[in-house]
């Protein structure tokens, strides 16, 4: 009753559908502002399916719409905190090939410790998508505060 | 012009689409941090098609990747009272079967009156979801303030 | 191996997967608190395909379950601003036909600046969706900033 | 088991201040919220304000909110109501009370405190 | 401020018959999927006990003899059976904001 069965045992490579969802592993040196993401089951819950992970940065395999989402968390966080140490932005975009290079989803924290959104946008095959945390907070590394992860939707 | 023609009339089932969007019923007694959750056509917007409710807890009927998303909204609630209380947070996890229990998805409130977030996970037939709420400020019930919803993506 | 090949060549349309993406364009005139959309490949990584635009609105051409999503961030907004202009909230609804009209969404901005959220909702052909902003401050119009989109998901 | 242990009676004059304690036992003080309320002699229920006990943030009935304080000590698991220049009419029971899960509505009351303002 | 208006102010009923108390605030009460307004038992020298709450959910221990319903800005109290230990005075409350305000009260006797 797979959908693949469904399919006449078409591989699901096939049919598109390539997912991926990140853990933080760790926040970039000094003039880095990137977060570098890390996927597998050996990991938990991650999971690359299609997508790739370059350098800790997410790397597109396929052409599409994809949904996009995020959620970070800072660690060790109050709205006072986050209210003195503002501002903390997030910003996810497509930052090589340097041609394509633009910010796709911007949230700042203000008094809170969360931001979480998402988005359809297209993606090509060789975007990489970087994730910018710009402020002096570091970011959780718990697997349900912190994730980020791209869905694909359609040609 | 529906899908199922598309695929030779086979049914929705066989292609694994499982789908629910769920409104709030009620909170748990003293002890117990759940909330309870109910769907069906005759309750407005809310709908389960493949996963089923068990005492208003989310119970998974096939194996994937699914979308999990949450919104909840604070009855009563202002910025004010909110910081006036307790830290109020929801998590969103796997609570049976026991030897899959894990949290998949957690948020506080800090000075804000609503959370919303989602995630990809991996999740199995039998898999039971709940939704824990500490704090002591009462969920809203409207349907467009408190809601929560699976989506299968793929196998 | 596009979805569309595997397939046997059927046309996306006949899949079902409607899709948009749409950026804001402009705010209504005074009594009028809706955001008015505008999506399309000229303008940047906005879309439509399926939903089409009714004079800034969404109008739904497919009947099915949907994925709606929206991320409003509010302009020169800090979390003082935003306390100080509360109430702030945003609504998302079928706004026609008059006998289908209802808030499917609905979120307040508090001390924050950007609010964003989804949720599935079974929408009809004709379905036209309404994104209501009551409060005095303007939404930013910076694309990766502020959304809002559908995704057809099942029947 | 939740309780809640108020200070004894007190007798004041007109224009004096009165302080009253309300020790919590049996739950996380600094969980719950703990509002007042007070009673005159054969008369209603009128509530006074609440804090809570985590930071201390008070909110006050506007009817006195210049003449109450609110103040809490984590070290003892005990709140105060503090309510200044005292007049007759001041004189009622004092009641501590709690929740059981959420704000609103009380399960749990202290025994009360008669404050008796007279010259 | 909300007011919250009791009646009767005093109410004798038989033994085993039913008592029924209202309540109307001055607006609603009823917001977010709740109505926010709750009963309390006092009998002489003690401190209030919580009945119900939420206009219509009954406290853990409550006999369920007491119920209680209604929304927006009218609500009732009921006792279906009166018994002798029921005797006391009965408030109602509101918590739909700040500052939470009781009604006057009404005195349950036996008849």
């Known amino acids: 009753q797979r959908f693949a069965q469904a399919q006449q045992q078409l591989p699901l490579e096939s049919l598109g559908w390539d997912v991926a969802e990140l853990q933080l592993n760790h926040t970039g040196p000094q003039q880095d502002p990137r977060l570098y993401w890390q996927g597998g089951p050996a990991l938990g819950r991650s999971f690359l399916h299609g997508p790739e992970l370059d350098k800790g940065q997410l790397r597109i395999h396929r052409d599409g719409i994809y949904m996009v989402h995020i959620q970070v968390t800072l660690a060790i966080c109050s709205s006072t905190t986050a209210s003195r140490h503002h501002p903390t932005t997030l910003a996810v975009g497509i930052c090589s090939p340097a041609s394509r290079s633009i910010s796709l989803l911007r949230l700042s924290f203000h008094q809170g410790c969360t931001i979480a959104s998402q988005r359809l946008t297209p993606l090509a095959r060789g975007d990489t998508l970087c994730t910018n945390l710009t402020g002096t907070l570091l970011p959780s590394r718990n697997t349900d505060e912190t994730f980020f992860g791209v869905q694909w939707v359609r040609p | 012009q529906r899908f199922a023609q598309a695929q030779q009339q086979l049914p929705l089932e066989s292609l694994g689409w499982d789908v629910a969007e769920l409104q709030l019923n009620h909170t748990g007694p003293q002890q117990d941090p759940r909330l309870y959750w109910q769907g069906g056509p005759a309750l407005g917007r809310s709908f389960l098609h493949g996963p089923e409710l068990d005492k208003g807890q989310l119970r998974i009927h096939r194996d994937g990747i699914y979308m999990v998303h949450i919104q909840v909204t604070l009855a009563i609630c202002s910025s004010t009272t909110a910081s006036r209380h307790h830290p109020t947070t929801l998590a969103v996890g796997i609570c049976s079967p026991a030897s899959r229990s894990i949290s998949l998805l957690r948020l506080s409130f800090h000075q804000g009156c609503t959370i919303a977030s989602q995630r990809l996970t991996p999740l199995a037939r039998g898999d039971t979801l709940c939704t824990n709420l500490t704090g002591t400020l009462l969920p809203s019930r409207n349907t467009d303030e408190t809601f929560f919803g699976v989506q299968w993506v793929r196998p | 191996q596009r979805f569309a090949q595997a397939q046997q060549q059927l046309p996306l349309e006949s899949l079902g997967w409607d899709v948009a993406e749409l950026q804001l364009n402009h705010t209504g005139p005074q009594q009028d608190p809706r955001l008015y959309w505008q999506g399309g490949p000229a303008l940047g990584r906005s879309f439509l395909h399926g939903p089409e635009l009714d004079k800034g609105q969404l109008r739904i051409h497919r009947d099915g379950i949907y994925m709606v999503h929206i991320q409003v961030t509010l302009a020169i907004c800090s979390s003082t601003t935003a306390s100080r202009h509360h109430p702030t909230t945003l609504a998302v609804g079928i706004c026609s036909p008059a006998s289908r009209s209802i808030s499917l969404l609905r979120l307040s901005f508090h001390q924050g600046c950007t609010i964003a959220s989804q949720r599935l909702t079974p929408l009809a052909r004709g379905d036209t969706l309404c994104t209501n902003l009551t409060g005095t401050l303007l939404p930013s119009r910076n694309t990766d900033e502020t959304f809002f989109g559908v995704q057809w998901v099942r029947p | 088991e939740v309780q809640m242990v108020q200070s004894g009676a007190e007798v004041k004059k007109p224009g004096a201040s009165v302080k009253v304690s309300c020790k919590a036992s049996?739950?996380?003080?600094?969980?719950?919220?703990i509002h007042w309320v007070r009673q005159a002699p054969g008369q209603g229920l009128e509530w006074m304000g609440d804090?809570?006990?985590?930071?201390?943030?008070?909110s006050y009935n506007q009817k006195f909110r210049d003449r109450v304080t609110m103040t809490r000590d984590t070290s003892t698991s005990t709140v105060y109501m503090e309510l200044s220049s005292l007049r007759s009419e001041d004189t009622a029971v004092y009641y501590c009370?709690?929740?059981?899960?959420?704000?609103?509505?009380?399960?749990?009351w202290g025994q009360g405190t008669l404050v008796t303002v007279s010259s | 401020d909300i007011v919250m208006t009791q009646s009767p102010d005093s109410l004798a009923v038989s033994l085993g018959e039913r008592a029924t108390i209202n309540c109307r605030a001055s607006?609603?009460?009823?917001?977010?999927?709740?109505?926010?307004m709750h009963w309390y038992q006092q009998k002489p020298g003690q401190p209030p006990k919580l009945l119900i709450y939420?206009?219509?959910n009954l406290e853990s221990g409550v006999p369920d003899r007491f119920s209680g319903s209604g929304s927006g800005t009218d609500f009732t109290l009921t006792i279906s059976s009166l018994q002798a230990e029921d005797v006391a005075v009965y408030y109602c409350?509101?918590?739909?904001?700040?500052?939470?305000?009781f009604g006057g009260g009404t005195k349950v006797e036996i008849k």
């Open positions: 607006r609603s009460v009823s917001t977010s999927g709740y109505s926010y």
């Open positions: 409350q509101h918590s739909r904001e700040l500052p939470y305000t």
């Open positions: 804090i809570y006990p985590g930071n201390g943030d008070a």
């Open positions: 939420l206009a219509s």
């Open positions: 049996g739950y996380t003080f600094t969980t719950y919220n």
């Open positions: 009370a709690t929740f059981s899960r959420f704000d609103g509505w009380f399960a749990y």
